[in-house]
């Protein structure tokens, strides 16, 4: 079982060899496409392969902002040729992500296909790591092999790579081991209960609040740190401000997501940025500790 997601992929190429990407769609080149063209071939060691975010079968929804559906294959290919002359293309790609049934906690293995020059899409964090503590996956690139498995998420502990234990392994060494792996990489992962934002831990409830700005401020102050897994919390509310008037947001509440973008593994600066670019309607996913002393 899979679900589809979309992501933006930026490739840098050159007019001679292009981006190393071939598209397939329709029966002949000038036929109007009734569905987006598919990636049918990725040239080895090309920009398309090295980015690690494209796979054969992905649907290309747009090329440099121009929708491919209802166009022709010739038009799509021409857009790619024109983009190669400018050395850069922005693709909007739809892809499948596996719906993995995984426990919210426990230790398990994940196998990922790997090519030498292609990143898996995993960012490892060792921030505030004490001796003997595991490395933490702080980010997973959308569209990457790691993302498409549907099993990995920020906050997962990375215990071993290809049976090499990482107990006292410096982050730099772990990154190097990952880079050098080929064919199939076996990751040993631990998920902890407290890593799951969705899980309603004892005495806590999570819900969503929608705020319409109408050009005005939200009336909230948030605090946290640049450590990726420190919580982002509401530290202040403007008196009679928009957020306070809802009655649903209080100082001390934890923000789990802004406009459906999870804050898991994100530092305070990113959360602030997400709020700044959130637009007129801001949706906040809040986690409230019910047994908090008054």
């Amino acid at each position: 079982i899979v679900h589809t997601e979309t992501t933006e992929v930026v490739l840098c190429g050159d007019p001679l060899s292009g981006f190393g990407l071939q598209l397939q769609g329709g029966i002949f080149a000038t036929e109007t496409l009734s569905s987006p063209p598919l990636v049918c071939f990725i040239e080895p060691d090309s920009p398309a392969e090295r980015c690690g975010l494209l796979q054969v079968g992905d649907r290309v929804l747009s090329i440099n902002g121009i929708a491919t559906e209802d166009g022709t294959m010739e038009e799509a290919n021409q857009l790619l040729r024109d983009a190669a002359l400018a050395h850069k293309v922005v693709l909007e790609v739809e892809f499948d992500v596996a719906e993995s049934v995984i426990p919210s906690s426990g230790t398990f293995h994940v196998k990922l296909p790997k090519k030498r020059s292609v990143e898996l899409g995993i960012t490892i964090s060792s921030a505030s790591r004490k001796r003997g503590e595991p490395l933490i996956i702080s980010d997973i690139k959308k569209g990457s092999v790691a993302h498409r498995t549907g099993t990995l998420e920020p906050g997962d502990k990375l215990l071993a790579i290809d049976n090499i234990r990482l107990d006292n392994c410096p982050m730099e060494d772990a990154v190097q081991i990952l880079r050098q792996c080929e064919d199939l990489v076996k990751l040993k992962i631990r998920k902890d209960e407290d890593n799951s934002d969705e899980l309603e831990t004892t005495g806590a409830v999570s819900y969503t609040v929608e705020l319409k700005r109408y050009g005005g401020p939200l009336g909230i102050t948030i605090s946290g740190t640049e450590e990726p897994f420190d919580p982002i919390v509401i530290s202040g509310l403007t008196k009679r401000g928009l957020a306070e008037r809802t009655g649903a947001i209080h100082v001390g509440d934890r923000i789990l997501a802004i406009n459906n973008v999870s804050l898991k593994g994100r530092p305070l600066s990113e959360a602030i940025h997400l709020l700044q670019v959130a637009g007129e309607t801001v949706t906040l996913k809040i986690k409230k500790q019910l047994d908090r002393p008054l």
Partner: antibody, heavy 117, light 106 residues
């Protein structure tokens, strides 16, 4: 391994009908357009008809338009060619081929259709 | 409809020769030109797609070039197994084949 296996060919009288089938395996059938290509004895290749992966779009060569109908059953991984009002000039080996980005990357072994009285 | 004209219709050559077959389209077809090889009693086999891309598993002595209306298939050093009939095919508007070029042993 991609395999295409045609069947249904044979001897038919002018004006008669015949239905060819092509059983596909080794790939996601519904993801690919499919075509029929024919070759008269001692002659070159002639594209006959094509159908999109979903079956929503069909195309025909002028020589068969109005007489032949291409269709597919994605649940059975099978391609069909219904041939009506057959003529002597339709005598040929009929190949089923997988259409991939405006070329044919896999072909069946062909089935012979002979139109004769 | 787009017409495809191959030349020559037949060609005699020897093992080791460099052979060139040309294909001309009645209108511009960009790079939507493919080449096939067919041996007697067998189904055609894709050699070159998109004018110059070598199909997986095809020997590197085969190469294709051209765009617009004029295209060529080149066999750099003819091998005994290369004696066959070669067809070009356009995929720009509908799908049409050239009449074929029969490559025979001299």
């Amino acid at each position: 391994e991609v395999q295409l296996l045609e069947s249904g060919g044979g001897l038919v009288q002018p004006g008669g009908s015949l239905r060819l089938s092509c059983a596909a395996s080794g790939f996601t059938f519904s993801s690919y357009a499919m075509s029929w290509v024919r070759q008269a004895p001692g002659k070159g290749l002639e594209w006959v008809s094509a159908i999109s992966g979903s079956g929503g779009s069909t195309y025909y060569a002028d020589s068969v338009k109005g007489r032949f109908t291409i269709s597919r059953d994605n649940s059975k991984n099978t391609l069909y060619l219904q041939m009506n009002s057959l003529r002597a000039e339709d005598t040929a080996v009929y190949y089923c081929a997988r259409s991939h980005a405006s070329y044919f990357d896999y072909w069946g072994q062909g089935t012979l259709v002979t139109v004769s009285s | 409809d787009i017409q495809m004209t191959q030349s020559p219709s037949s060609l005699s050559a020897s093992v080791g020769d460099r052979v060139t077959i040309t294909c001309r389209a009645s209108q511009s077809i960009s790079s939507y030109l493919n080449w096939y090889q067919q041996k007697p009693g067998k189904a055609p086999k894709l050699l070159i797609y998109a004018a110059s891309s070598l199909q997986s598993g095809v020997p590197s002595r085969f190469s294709g070039s051209g765009s617009g209306t004029d295209f060529t298939l080149t066999i750099s050093s003819l091998q005994p197994e290369d004696f066959a009939t070669y067809y070009c095919q356009q995929g720009y508007y509908l799908l049409t084949f050239g009449q074929g070029t029969k490559l025979e042993i001299k």
